[in-house]
């Protein structure tokens, strides 16, 4: 058993049928010695008396808010949560496996630049009685500071019969140098509590591996005289690290017909302009990627050919 | 330790071309190592990220763009020895800063070259003959060093008398390649920045 926060405790259980569970001793936070009784949640049934209460915690019916009283007055509370270990592996019931970029990916994180700011998000089908808290650091043995905000519900989607909820959090490394070569990964830890179930999820990454630039901005077409060709131009996104001559991007320009089956013409360039043939009803899209370290491509920025 | 005397090439930028070749070569070599050594811990998540140049060179700091010198997190342990975006080698200070940066890059390349050659000699003794260093990568390191045009004492190749532990050697190869790829990215960024200056 360990303390998650004041008056909230997590009991770790080897979870299998007929398991013996864990013996837990609760102590009433009071100078009083006599006349103390204990109850669980809203029930008025007295579970025991005395300054300490010994219970055998086996399943969720044994978890909850234990309260000690004296003469009708509440003295203190202890909330017991359960953390299930199933065959040597901690349960992952609360969050959905996003399966991207690989199986067992519960937390996904992205950064728009090298400033040390990043966003993580996760999915669940649970809509109520759910709380998250997020901590982060650079490295784990001698951790350096990363500050995270509160996790917020950022999207709701319908997936088949189920509703899916996306939560996200923003974090910022306290003293980040955009040009630094990372040798210690960022660690992100999410505590999830659903009713009386506790779970924790972690992700470890280098900022360089989670970079995903914003799409190029100010995408424009300039027709070339006496030609079906157009000059496409764009600019670096505002959120990208500067100076751009140091943090350079490379671009992919795509001409896509109305039908998805039509052949796509693609051009790769390090410049912020390109000359392409604009077909009728086609659209031109441009996306960006770090020129020197191949992390994710940005989303496409698009304009119609006409 | 005395820094080598700099004679930077005024038309900087064969260096840009060579640094791009270097990044391509080390990335290919790393990809090959990850595929060939699939049963070894060779992914970024599994290896310890060690930097053989730590405390010996200071490439990131010495080559910091002027715009980032206002960022205190980038200046944690040094005087403002940064490269400038002023006209190429316009002043003596600029020239000195750039020389410091380029000599630091040169020292990096020299250290990695020695490590890779020593390692290749060990890998050639492996009865499994599982993996060797790409000669193209070694050649590209050499070309960039020549383009940087520094004169520096040659470091003798380390020789080891004991029987090599091939498992450890292959894991060390992965560690070196990961670190060298990161340094090659920095070198490419620096050359691109200097080219634009």
């Amino acid at each position: 058993i360990w303390e998650l926060k004041k008056d909230v405790y997590v009991v770790e259980l080897d979870w299998y049928p007929d398991a013996p569970g864990e013996m837990v001793v609760l102590t009433c936070d009071t100078p009083e010695e006599d006349g103390i009784t204990w109850t669980l949640d809203q029930s008025s049934e007295v579970l025991g008396s005395g300054k300490t209460l010994t219970i055998q915690v086996k399943e969720f019916g044994d978890a909850g808010q234990y309260t000690c009283h004296k003469g009708g007055e509440v003295l203190s509370h202890s909330l017991l949560l359960l953390h299930k270990k199933e065959d040597g592996i901690w349960s992952t019931d609360i969050l959905k496996d996003q399966k991207e970029p690989k199986n067992k990916t519960f937390l996904r994180c992205e950064a728009k630049n090298y400033s040390g700011r990043f966003t993580c998000w996760w999915l669940t089908t649970i809509s109520t009685d759910l709380t998250f808290s997020v901590k982060s650091s650079r490295g784990s043995s001698d951790p350096q500071g990363v500050t995270c905000g509160a996790a917020t519900l950022s999207a709701e989607r319908v997936r088949g019969d189920n509703k899916e909820y996306e939560y996200s959090v923003e974090c910022q490394e306290d003293s980040a140098c955009p040009a630094a070569e990372e040798s210690l990964p960022i660690e992100v830890m999410v505590d999830a509590v659903h009713k009386l179930k506790y779970e924790n999820y972690t992700s470890s990454f280098f900022i360089r591996d989670i970079i995903k630039p914003d799409p190029p901005k100010n995408l424009q077409l300039k027709p070339l005289k006496n030609s079906r060709q157009v000059e496409v131009s764009w600019e670096y996104p505002d959120t990208w690290s500067t100076p751009h001559s140091y943090f350079s991007l490379t671009f992919c320009v795509q001409v896509q017909g109305k039908s998805k089956r039509e052949k796509k013409d693609r051009v790769f360039t390090d410049k912020t302009s390109a000359t392409v043939i604009c077909r009728k009803n086609a659209s031109i899209s441009v996306r960006a990627q770090d020129r020197y370290y191949s992390s994710s491509w940005s989303e496409w920025a698009s304009v119609p050919c006409s | 330790r005395n820094l080598p005397v700099a004679t930077p090439d005024p038309g900087m930028f064969p260096c840009l071309h060579h640094s791009q070749n270097l990044l391509r070569a080390v990335s290919n070599m790393l990809q090959k190592a990850r595929q060939t050594l699939e049963f070894y811990p060779c992914t970024s998540e599994e290896i310890d990220h060690e930097d053989i140049t730590k405390d010996k060179t200071s490439t990131v700091e010495a080559c910091l763009p002027l715009e980032l010198t206002k960022n205190e997190s980038c200046l944690n342990s040094r005087e403002t020895s940064f490269i400038t975006n002023g006209s190429c080698l316009a002043s003596r200070k600029t020239s000195f800063m750039m020389a410091l940066c380029l000599s630091s890059i040169y020292e990096d390349l020299k250290m990695y070259q020695v490590e890779f050659k020593t390692m290749n000699a060990k890998l050639l003794m492996d009865p499994k003959r599982q993996i060797f260093l790409d000669q193209n990568m070694l050649a590209v390191i050499d070309e960039l060093m020549q383009a940087l045009n520094f004169n520096s004492e040659t470091v003798p190749q380390k020789s080891s008398l004991e029987e090599p532990d091939f498992y450890k050697t292959k894991i060390k190869l992965c560690i070196l390649l990961h670190a060298f790829r990161i340094r090659a990215v920095t070198i490419d960024r620096v050359m691109s920045y200097l080219n634009a200056s």
Epitope: N103 | F39, P41
Partner: antibody, heavy 115, light 112 residues
Framework: QVQLVQSGGGVVQPGRSLRLSCAAS????????MHWVRQAPGKGLEWVAF????????YYADSVKGRFTISRDNSKNTLYLQMKSLRAEDTAVYYC????????WGQGTMVTVSS | SYVLTQPPSVSGTPGQRVTISCSGG????????VKWYQQLPGTAPKLLIY???QRPSGVPDRFSGSKSGTSASLAITGVQAEDEADYYC????????????FGTGTKVTVLG
């Protein structure tokens, strides 16, 4: 004590269907994940499928994906394996088992796919 | 296809020490615990070892388990005639959990 009693095995022709059941008692069935494991005659153990305690997630071996469906009825304390498009290579003893460090197995039920 | 490899058979005379190996990889045995089962002819498997080296109550202490790196082993010290059975190791893979990974199985024969 924990008990898992299996039923539903038998002889079936290729291409036909069969449903296996596993009735649980002696524990809170709705709190635990469950597996199906099979063993072809003279061969080793092969995992078939898993279902979470609440039925929300199901996992299958590639060899049965799209043909077999694992399900549970927590109100009846029963686990099921619906097997469709059966093949000769599905011939095996099928076991249900609880998920956890200490597990309990059903007695096994024989499924023979033969024309 | 089996990812955990065991020797097809091992044998020993009563009282001898018999060991069975189970070889896997970094993503299974290398990072997840191992179980061992005993299966007597015509019966369901019986748990012998969980958590690499833990014995459930009722399992004789002549059975012991261990793990090192990407391999695990089961030792029977002072093998007895009633130990003649098939033995299976079991683990999970980090990427496919909760799918069970079973070893290829080892037939233990007690001679004499």
């Amino acid at each position: 004590q924990v008990q898992l009693v299996q039923s539903g095995g038998g002889v079936v022709q290729p291409g036909r269907s069969l449903r296996l059941s596993c009735a649980a008692s002696g524990f809170t069935f709705s709190s635990y994940g469950m597996h199906w494991v099979r063993q072809a005659p003279g061969k080793g153990l092969e995992w078939v499928a898993f279902i979470r305690y609440d039925g929300s997630n199901k996992y299958y071996a590639d060899s049965v994906k799209g043909r077999f469906t694992i399900s549970r009825d927590n109100s009846k304390n029963t686990l099921y394996l619906q097997m469709k498009s059966l093949r000769a290579e599905d011939t095996a003893v099928y076991y249900c088992k609880t998920h956890g460090s200490h597990d309990n197995w059903g007695q096994g039920t024989m499924v023979t796919v033969s024309s | 296809s089996y990812v955990l490899t065991q020797p097809p058979s091992v044998s020993g005379t009563p009282g001898q020490r018999v060991t069975i190996s189970c070889s896997g990889g970094r993503s299974n045995i290398g990072s997840i615990t191992v179980k061992w089962y005993q299966q007597l002819p015509g019966t369901a498997p019986k748990l012998l070892i969980y958590g690499n080296d833990q014995r459930p109550s009722g399992v004789p202490d002549r059975f012991s388990g261990s793990k090192s790196g990407t391999s695990a082993s089961l030792a029977i010290t002072g093998v007895q005639a009633e130990d003649e059975a098939d033995y299976y190791c079991q683990s999970y893979d980090r990427g496919t959990h909760p799918a069970l990974l079973f070893g290829t199985g080892t037939k233990v024969t007690v001679l004499g």
